[in-house]
Interface confidence: low
């Protein structure tokens, strides 16, 4: 029985050219996290494997940094980065938990939640 819940940063926005952290947190379960996948719609951004560490997809290597923790930092944001992002927790014995984050990248100089989530 899957008892865990995933908390995410939810719907967030940031300015074009800036950086932002995507973060999920799995709680309320004693299941062991074996791997976390970060995906943007149908594209794999990165994997954090409990034994093998981080792997960043080659096409994102210049703009994605691992961390902090199991989160992911997106850099040099463009308007094309707007969209859904998913953190997929592979756990044992529970199975798979998925969290969703919606990121909006804004052209303007004022981004909602910008002070809270954007890297200075």
């Amino acid at each position: 029985m899957m008892t865990g819940t995933i908390e995410t940063t939810g719907n967030i926005s940031a300015e074009k050219g800036g950086s932002i952290i995507l973060q999920c947190h799995l709680s309320s379960t004693t299941a062991q996290v074996t791997q976390v996948n970060w995906e943007q719609q149908d594209q794999l951004l990165a994997i954090c494997n409990a034994d093998l560490g981080w792997h960043i997809s080659p096409s994102f290597k210049d703009r994605v940094a691992p961390g902090p923790g199991l989160g992911l930092t997106l850099q040099s944001l463009t308007v094309n980065d707007t969209g859904e992002y998913f953190c997929i927790y592979h756990t044992y014995p529970d199975g798979t938990y998925t969290g969703r984050i919606f990121l909006e990248v804004l052209e303007s100089s004022v981004a909602e939640h910008g002070a809270r989530f954007q890297i200075p």
Epitope: E7, T8, P68, G69, F117
Partner: nanobody
Framework: EVQLVESGGGLVQPGGSLRLSCAAS????????MGWFRQAPGKEREAVAS????????YYADSVKGRFTISADNSKNTAYLQMNSLKPEDTAVYYC?????????????WGQGTLVTVSS
């Protein structure tokens, strides 16, 4: 409001050691993950090391593996970065980042940075 205060930076000779501290304060919250990033003059900010709250997941950049050690004291919401065998190329402003959980959900905060200079 959650704030991060870094300390421990300074001037050190090649081969020397420094210990950076990052203390989070400012409200009812708990850290989910904490990490260290660095930015050298004219370069992109890069992930150095990060740690999940439980301590069972850590990340190190290849350039610091075996030389830097990240740790955290959850009771104090504080992260540490022990830096040994420092090299001139480690010279940078080191930033602490924390993902935290509070009544308003998951958030991220960055410190203002502490300068580490490795030079003879």
């Amino acid at each position: 409001e959650v704030q991060l205060v870094e300390s421990g930076g300074g001037l050190v000779q090649p081969g020397g050691s420094l210990r950076l501290s990052c203390a989070a304060s400012g409200g009812a919250f708990s850290t989910v993950a904490m990490g260290w990033f660095r930015q050298a003059p004219g370069k992109e900010r890069e992930a150095v090391a990060s740690i999940w709250r439980s301590g069972d997941s850590t990340y190190y950049a290849d350039s610091v593996k075996g030389r830097f050690t990240i740790s955290a004291d959850n009771s104090k919401n504080t992260a540490y970065l022990q830096m040994n065998s420092l090299k001139p190329e480690d010279t940078a402003v080191y930033y602490c980042a924390s993902s935290y959980s509070s009544s308003s959900g998951l958030g991220d905060i960055w410190g203002q940075g502490t300068l580490v200079t490795v030079s003879s």
